[in-house]
Each structure stands twice: as C-alpha cells, then as structure tokens.
C-alpha cells in the first residue's frame, strides 16, 4: 500500500489539458526530496518525463511543467495539447530514482466523441448566445415551425412560430426569418446556461412530410485557467468577455462554496480583505478589462471568476472567465513588514524589493487610491520626477545590485496613512504593498536641526546642525540635497566622529553642514539622516532660504519656507547620461494615474539613476564654488 | 438549494453486486467533486470513491479497500453520480453517503473538503 494518493483513472479529450495532483505523507524529507512523473513501459521500466529536478522530456517539452506545494504536501503535473499517444500508465512519486514511493495512474485520452452524421452540433460558452439554423422545404413554407427540446419521454416545445415561448425561455428565445429566405428559419437562445445543453429538434410542417433537424446543444463552463503565483507577489487577472456586454458593470468574485463572493466590481464594491492592493482596469470598448491583486497570502489561493453583469454581481446565464490560483510559499520574493508605523513629523524609510536580475529596471512608488475602480499615481520614480505636493520630504534611493531600492518620505501628517505599492518596469510579480501607518507624536523627535528658521545670507558662511541621540552614535550620519530627482549626498569629511568613546554625551551629539560661501544654488530643501550600510533610517528636512544682504527683513518668512517653500530647485545632473532622459512624461494614463502610468520602457542600457549614489559623493561636483562639510562634535 | 439523493441501497450476500446512484441538483460552478464515503456502525466516515470534473476531463479516486472492486462513474452536466460496487463482504457493510463539492479543491478523501451530503443509503452484505 503506497502512501502516495492521486487519481488513478484520468479521462480527457483529446486537444485538451490535464492536472493532477498527487499527495503525499507530511514529512520534511518528502517536501523537500525530488518529484516525478514517469510512464511505464511494457518491461515495467518507468521512464521519466518530468522531475521536480528540472528534468523535462522531449515530448513534454512547451507543454508540461511539475510544482511541489510543500505547505500543501501535494505536487501538480499538468499536461496540456493531449494527443491519444498520452494514453496509458504512469507514476507520480517521490524519490531520487523511479523506484521510491510513487502511485499508478492511469490517463485515457479519447477522440472528440462523434455524433449521428444528421446531427448539427452546436458548441458554446455559459452567457454567450446560440442561433440555430433549422432549414426546410418550399412546401413548408407556410407551415408552423417550432423548436423543441429533447426529454426522456417527449420533446418538450422551446418556441414556435405561433409566439408560443417555453417559461424558461422567456426573453431569451426568438424565431425569426432572414430576409425573402423562405427555405430556412432560425431560433436564438441568448444567455446560455448548463440546462440549455442537449439535444433539440427543429420543425416545419406536421406528419410525414415535416422537415426535421436534430441539433446537439453543448454548453461548457469554461475550464479554470490554472495560475501559479509565488506568496507576496502580484497576479494580474485578464478578462476577456467580448463585445456583448462591453456596456455592463464587471465583477470579480471567488467562488465561496455556495456562492461566488465579489471581491471588486466597477460599480465601486470591493471586499476589505483586498483594501490596498487591487485595481480594476477596464481595458478597452470590447469587454476587456483586468484586475490586478498584489502582495498575495496564503488565503488568496482558490477559485476566481471575472463577468458581467449590469448589478455588478454573478448572475447565471451572463458570461464568465474563471480561474484557479495557487499560492506557493516558496517564494522569491523577502518577507518584509507590510505595515510600517511613522509619527506625524517623522519619517519612514521603506525598502522596496525588486527582481535582482532586473537592477537596470526603472523602480517606482505609487499611491494606492480606492476611489472608483481604484488607480495608483506615481508619487516618484528613478525616472518621474517627485509630484509637487511631495516636495522636499519624498526621495528615492536606488541601491543597484542588490534587490532593494528605499523610498523615504518625512515630515509626515496623518494624511499620509495609507496604501503604497512598490513596482518597476520589468518583473510585475515583484509588486509589493505597503500599509503606511501614521500616529501622533507624543515625544520630540530623533534628529532635530537648529537653526529652525534657516536664512542664508549669500557670499556668507552658514552652518545648520543637526542634532541626534546616542543610540544612532554607530550609524553613519549624512546631510543631503533634495531635488525632485531625488537627495544627492553631500561629501562629507569626518572631524573625530569614529574616536573611541566610552561614554555618550546626549547633548553634544550633532552632525553639521557648512555652505561656504552660500550661493543661490544654495537655497532649497536639505535632509539630515541615518544609514547603516544600505539601509536608510530616520530623516528630518529643512529648507533653507537664500537672500542678498540687507538691512531689512528677510524677503523669505523663514517659518512659511520650513513648511513647504515652494521655490523652483535646481539640481546638477549625477551622471550626463540622464539628462536628457530625465524630464520624459510617461503616456498613457490608466491605473497609474497622473500620466505617470508604469510601462515597460523596455531594456535599459544602462541603469538609470536619478537619486544620488547614497553611499559615494563620487562625480557629485558643484556648480557653485560653496564647500560641503560634514563635521562631527 | 443543494440536494442529494441517493438511491440502490440494500441486502446482498457476499461476493454479490450492488449499483448505488446519487442526483445531485442545484449544485453550483462549473467544475465539480462527488464522492461516496461509508459509515459502519460506531466507526467514522470513511472515503470509499470520488470523481472530479474540469471541464471535459474527469479524475476518478479510489481507497486502497475498494481498488478493484468497485468503479465509481458520473455524468457532470446531469450531477450524477454511480457506484458500481462487486464481489461485496462483510466489511463492506455501512451507510453509504454521497457527498458534492462545487469545485475541486482539497483533498478528495476528506470529508471535510465536500460542502454538500446526502442522507445515506444503507448496504448490508450478510449470508
């Protein structure tokens, strides 16, 4: 008695697809040992076509694959494009070689069944719309025609000519002739449902002399299009139920036992359980339209079926697309906090994980908004520049190579609470989802800058410092410069910061900037902030204003400037490569509002940074003579 | 509302056949799960055979005690659902219960993974 269980007997048609699962007993070496599928031979040799290994036969190859589902202790081979050659007896097991546990299977792939030659067959969707073509004599003409649906006992009438209608039928059936045709009648039955299917007799006349026709009405659910997405990743539901009901409201819902439970429409309804990271896009004027969920759990796995519907909600009879998801815990992508907590004037810095082996892609942090059928602007971009409400307090740090890029946002206000997605322009798997939590601050903050009222004097030396507690005594300290593409770092030469200390001196822990002498280049947003290695910590802004010497009063309200000054920046460009790439609009506006819509720019030659390199100030010359000093006391 | 029905329960003696049936109507989804699962006396339900349909591909399970024996069969569209059951024994007495599920995810042989059950028909193999 083997311990592995599958199906033994697997019957399908040929053309069409199969997955079959097979399980296996709950122990970490069967998760983690290898899996196969194998066809046995007359010797009682079994020969391997597909292994968890990577292994995959030429017959199978571009239409099998084999997923292990540890968290499930199940694993899947799907077959598609079966020919009647797939016939026969097979093994799925677990082992390194053929000979370790496994369990027979046996698949019979059968010819599409034929029909008695005088049957017109008629083959259709659930929701989608059949006319039948019923043709007959001259003499016929002006006899009663009629449709009538095979029973057991009798033929139970659909519709006939005299506007009789079966109850059933109401509303969905209609006879009618084509034009001065006077040979041929047609019956339409629109919104087909699993009861329509059978076999239906179309009339004209009555007795011996009647035209007859038998038609065989199938009506197929659509097969389940099988998804397999890692945990933490994005699925992207494509849906295509053509132009007759381009008009009606959309629908996705998953299939609930009973019922099929709606999870977003365009109507507005959407299940809190998808709060944050799910769009609906309708696509075009024929039908189409998608829905894309990000940052999969466990519990997202399942039955999913898109339609449409005037209510928004499943209705029999109407059109659907339906699918399975798998969810698979193995997954590529890091498990990072989907909620990250600030307080209100503080800062947070989220690191975005995107596919390594796509450093060169554009990275991007959008907004999630739930209102309508739900869009994500793009609130800054490697190559987007910061959108004007976010100036001075939202920067991106790209750090190539290694799987990450950080998003800072500071000076936060409970506006800010919210969903953010992480996404590029390559691997949309990679999509992440951020629940920013903003609370109110009961305690000053970390790093503080004095002066707070920050007016340079131009030709001057000025010097603002920024003040930071013990704790961040180990971390790296920098000041930068903010522009809306991004916070360039400013060299920094330490003055004793790395003398060994014993003690912490809670007051005199500060980190400065010099800007000597203060130009008008000079004037905008600077950052103060925290890193160890590659991983950004907290942040605080100040804006520091530039005027010429006078007697008066300062030309800038200080405190309005500390705010939110809005004054046009200017930033040298890094690296000369992307100067010219740097202002482009990105078209076509969609779920990614704001005409900043994510597309795949395709292959970049090279990586395209617009933010400072956070851990270098190579190339980050000055148009100005001023001199940059960090200094540390 | 989900019903199911079962039918063709009765006395047989050992090594003699029987043929159960079971309709299922008002079964929602387009793919579908049905099961039969046998409860002897004082024991738990136990899985006997089950058949899944995905579109135009069937799957049929079996237990290990029936392999053989018995051969379950079923027509989607109609939600029905046959069991075929030879060369009967002792053993092999119980109510047996037809069990639906819209859908075919799970574990065929748990009982917990079918959302919809019959009453029971009853089979006893006796000389």
């Known amino acids: 008695k083997s311990p592995i269980f599958g199906p033994q007997e697997v019957s399908s048609i040929e053309g069409d697809s199969v997955s079959i699962t097979c399980y296996y007993p709950d122990t970490s070496v069967n998760r983690h040992t290898r899996k196969y599928w194998c066809r046995q031979g007359a010797s009682g040799m079994c020969t391997t076509l597909i292994s968890s290994n990577g292994y995959l036969s030429k017959e199978y190859s571009g239409r099998a694959n084999l997923i292990n589902f540890p968290e499930n202790n199940t694993f899947v081979i799907n077959i598609e494009q079966l020919t009647q050659d797939d016939t026969g007896s097979y093994k799925c097991g677990l082992g390194t070689s053929n000979r370790g546990l496994s369990f027979d299977v046996s698949l019979e792939v059968s010819q599409v069944p034929e029909l008695p030659s005088d049957t017109h067959v008629y083959t259709k969707d659930i929701g989608r719309n059949v006319t039948i073509e019923c043709p007959f004599k001259r003499e016929n003409a002006p006899s009663k025609k009629s449709l009538c649906k095979k029973t057991n006992q009798s033929c139970e009438l659909v519709i006939d000519s005299t506007e009789k209608v079966n109850p059933s039928y109401i509303g969905r059936a209609k006879l009618f002739m084509k034009g001065t045709d006077l040979t041929v009648f047609y019956v339409n039955i629109s919104h087909l449902t699993h009861n329509d299917a059978g076999l239906y007799i179309c009339q004209a006349g009555e007795g011996p002399s009647a035209d007859k026709k038998n038609v065989d009405l199938q009506v197929l659910a659509p097969e389940p299009e099988l998804l397999y997405k890692d945990l933490r990743s994005s699925v992207t539901f494509e849906c295509d139920l053509g132009r007759e009901v381009a008009n009606e409201a959309k629908y996705l819902c998953r299939m609930n036992k009973e019922t099929c439970d709606v999870i977003i429409n365009t109507l507005g309804k959407r299940d809190p359980d998808f709060e944050g990271r799910i769009l609906i896009t309708p696509k075009d004027d024929n039908g189409r339209f998608s829905v894309l969920i990000t940052g999969l759990r466990k519990e997202d796995a399942g039955h999913y079926q898109c339609g449409a519907h005037s209510s928004g909600l499943p209705q029999e009879g109407w059109p659907i697309q339906t699918w399975q998801l798998f969810v698979n815990e193995e997954s590529t992508i890091p498990n990072r906090r989907s909620v990250v907590k600030g307080v209100t004037g503080g800062s947070v810095a989220i690191a975005c994980p995107y596919n390594p082996k796509e450093s060169s892609s554009l990275k991007y942090w959008c907004r999630w908004e739930g209102d309508g059928n739900g869009h994500c602007p793009v609130l800054v971009g490697t190559q987007a520049q910061v959108q004007e409400e976010y100036e001075g307090r939202l920067a991106l740090f790209d750090q190539p190579g290694n799987g990450t890029y950080t998003v800072i946002l500071n000076q936060l206000t409970t506006e800010d609470a919210g969903f953010y997605w992480c996404l590029t322009n390559g691997d949309s798997r990679w999509r992440t989802t951020i629940e920013l939590q903003v609370a109110e601050a009961t305690r000053e903050p970390n790093l503080e800058v004095t002066p707070q009222n920050a007016t340079a004097v131009l030709g001057e030396t000025f010097t603002v410092s920024c003040h930071y507690p013990c704790k961040f005594y180990s971390q790296e300290k920098y000041w930068c410069k903010w522009s809306n593409k991004g916070c360039h770092i400013l060299p920094s030469h330490d003055e004793g910061a790395r003398q060994s200390s014993v003690s912490c001196d809670q007051s005199s822990q500060l980190v400065s900037m010099t800007l000597n002498p203060v130009s008008k280049e000079d004037e905008g947003w600077y950052w103060c902030g925290v890193k160890q290695g590659q991983t950004y910590g907290e942040t605080t802004a100040i804006y520091i204003a530039v005027e010429e010497r006078t007697r008066g009063s300062s030309h800038v309200n200080p405190t309005d400037a500390n705010a939110r000054a809005k004054v046009a920046l200017e930033e040298e460009v890094v690296d000369s490569s992307i100067s010219e790439k740097e202002n482009k609009a990105i078209p076509n506006p969609g779920p990614f509002a704001n005409e900043r819509e994510i597309q795949n720019v395709g292959d970049q030659a090279q990586e395209n940074r617009a933010s400072g390199d956070a851990g270098s100030a190579d190339g980050q010359s000055r148009s100005s003579s001023s001199k940059h000093h960090h200094h540390h006391h | 509302e989900v019903q199911l029905v079962e039918s063709g329960g009765g006395l047989v003696q050992p090594g003699g056949s029987l043929r159960l049936s079971c309709v299922a109507s008002?079964?929602?989804?387009?793919?579908?799960?049905m099961a039969w699962f046998a409860q002897a006396p004082g024991k738990e339900r136990e899985f006997v055979a089950a058949?899944?349909?995905?579109?135009?591909?069937?799957?049929?399970y079996y237990s290990d005690s029936v392999k053989g024996r018995f051969t379950v069969s079923g027509d989607n569209a109609k939600r029905t659902l046959d069991l075929q059951m030879k060369d009967l024994n002792p053993e092999d007495t119980a109510l047996y219960f037809c069990?639906?599920?819209?859908?075919?995810?799970?574990?065929?042989?748990?009982?917990?993974?079918?959302?919809?059950w019959g009453q029971g028909t009853q089979v006893t193999v006796s000389s």
């Open positions: 069990a639906a599920h819209p859908n075919d995810d799970g574990d065929p042989r748990i009982s917990g993974n079918y959302q919809y």
């Open positions: 008002g079964l929602p989804g387009s793919s579908s799960r």
């Open positions: 058949i899944a349909w995905r579109g135009r591909t069937s799957y049929k």
